[in-house]
């Protein structure tokens, strides 16, 4: 008796965070034996879509020509082979940006900060929101969530960083969202460039602290430190 069919791989191109109106392609890759691919969307009647395999039959393409709120959500795919259905893939979370107006991102006391000191990034929205996200460009794990307790809505969230090192330098944006759909985000804030200069005692960053390439500290989640950032908001890392 053969074991269960290997689960397929699910991914999105150009990525899983898509601006409203832009196109996105979801790919499901199974095996050469696949006869049919199905895509399930959480809380939708299954299957959300089905496709015949593309030659050489080991994957299928699910096209979304124009991203809207309806497409945002959590997906899994699976395939049928001559011996039955595969296990479902790991989930893909498709997020749409542009659902709400853009927040403002600023740095306190300044976007120019000395290594070893503290800085707080402040994300402010015009209307009350209950989730704020901070994203650092080119980070493998870019999302930092601040979600309000008990559904209380806030106009802003603070992301404190202490002590700052050269790794914290870079370009940031923030988003705001409502808790009823974590897959719908605001337009991105304008970018904020955080510039970290060397301390007086250490004018040149050591090699281990320098701005890294692909496999270095940039690939680690940005973890804020310090006290709870804002009354009613709690830190939530995903």
């Amino acid at each position: 008796q053969a074991g269960p069919l290997p689960k397929p791989t699910l991914w999105a191109e150009p990525g899983s965070v898509i601006s409203w109106g832009n196109s996105v392609t979801i790919w499901c890759q199974g095996t050469l034996e696949a006869r049919e691919y199905r895509l399930d969307k959480e809380e939708s009647p299954a299957p959300w879509d089905r496709q015949n395999p593309l030659e050489p039959k080991n994957k299928a393409r699910f096209s979304i020509p124009s991203m809207t709120e309806d497409y945002a959500g959590r997906y899994r795919c699976y395939y049928r082979s001559p011996v039955g259905w595969s296990q479902p893939s790991d989930p893909l979370e498709l997020v749409m940006t542009g659902a709400y107006s853009k927040p403002t991102l600023s740095a306190l006391p300044s976007p120019l900060v000395t290594s070893g000191k503290s800085v707080t990034l402040l994300c402010q929205s015009r209307s009350p929101m209950d989730t704020f996200l901070l994203i650092k460009e080119r980070a493998a794990h870019p999302l930092l969530h601040l979600r309000s307790e008990h559904g209380a809505q806030q106009h802003q969230a603070e992301f404190p960083m202490s002590p700052v090192t050269s790794v914290h330098g870079g370009t940031y944006r923030c988003f705001s969202s409502h808790g009823f759909s974590h897959y719908l985000l605001s337009h991105p804030s304008d970018p904020l460039e955080l510039i970290v200069s060397g301390s007086l005692e250490d004018p040149r960053p050591s090699p281990t602290r320098s701005v890294s390439t692909a496999a270095g500290p940039e690939d680690q989640p940005l973890m804020p430190t310090g006290s709870v950032p804002h009354s009613g908001l709690r830190r939530h890392w995903e």
């Epitope: 006869r35 939708s44 009647p45 299954a46 299957p47 959300w48 089905r50 015949n52 309806d70 001559p82």
Partner: antibody, heavy 120, light 106 residues
Framework: EVQLKESGAELVKPGASVKLSCKAS????????MHWVKQRPGQGLEWIGE????????NYNEKFTSKATLTVDQSSSTAYMQLSSLTSEDSAVYYC?????????????WGQGTALTVSS | DIVMTQSPSSLSASLGGKVTITCKAS??????IAWYQHKPGKGPRLLIH???TLQPGIPSRFSGSGSGRDYSFSISNLEPEDIATYFC????????FGGGTKLEIK
């Protein structure tokens, strides 16, 4: 009881368009894909395409991509197929058929068919 | 596309007798074949799926068998209401139908 009731026979002129309907009852309309099948006189059946009533996603037989357009109206549990630029080759009986997801079988219930005649 | 060759195109049999219809696929269809009964003015009725699985409510007089490329469908103890056209459908890869068999009673 699952039922698929299709619209009545149509006589249309070449070059025109026609919209056939298929009203579903006896089950949750949005939980099953709806397929359309063509049968020309004295010939076999051909699969045209399918639509997911819950979100409007469609898949077509390549042969029919520029001929047929599938839509649904959730409020009336009705599926539609519009056929455009009609020629005598489109004269046929068209069936709607419900997809069965649990057994993989594409069609477990069918409508009675709509006869389309294209003639000047 | 997979081609399904169904035979015979028509046949005549006696009440109480048995008939067998075959469908041959142009390639292995891994038992993904269904059989339907079609009467004039009505929609086709699903009798059997996955080669031999009888649909609920279908009498056991109907049966199916086969594997690989070769499949058969039989009706035993023929009754008057069995007069119809029968066709196969493969759903292993895309969807293609057999040409149909018209059954008449002698």
């Amino acid at each position: 009881e699952v039922q698929l009731k299709e619209s009545g026979a149509e006589l249309v002129k070449p070059g025109a368009s026609v919209k056939l309907s298929c009203k579903a009852s006896g089950y949750t309309f949005t939980s099953h894909w709806m397929h359309w099948v063509k049968q020309r006189p004295g010939q076999g059946l051909e699969w045209i395409g399918e639509i997911n009533p819950s979100n409007g996603r469609t898949n077509y037989n390549e042969k029919f991509t520029s001929k047929a357009t599938l839509t649904v109206d959730q409020s009336s549990s009705t599926a539609y197929m519009q056929l455009s630029s009609l020629t005598s080759e489109d004269s046929a009986v068209y069936y709607c058929a419900r997809g069965n997801l649990t057994t993989v079988v594409p069609f477990d219930y069918w409508g009675q068919g709509t006869a389309l005649t294209v003639s000047s | 596309d997979i081609v399904m060759t169904q035979s015979p195109s028509s046949l005549s049999a006696s009440l109480g007798g048995k008939v067998t219809i075959t469908c041959k696929a142009s390639q292995d269809i891994n038992k993904f074949i269904a059989w339907y009964q079609h009467k004039p003015g009505k929609g086709p009725r699903l009798l059997i799926h996955f080669t031999s699985t009888l649909q609920p409510g279908i009498p056991s007089r109907f049966s199916g068998s086969g594997s690989g490329r070769d499949y058969s469908f039989s009706i035993s103890n023929l009754e008057p209401e069995d007069i119809a056209t029968y066709f196969c459908l493969q759903y292993d890869l895309l969807l293609t139908f057999g040409g149909g068999t018209k059954l008449e009673i002698k």
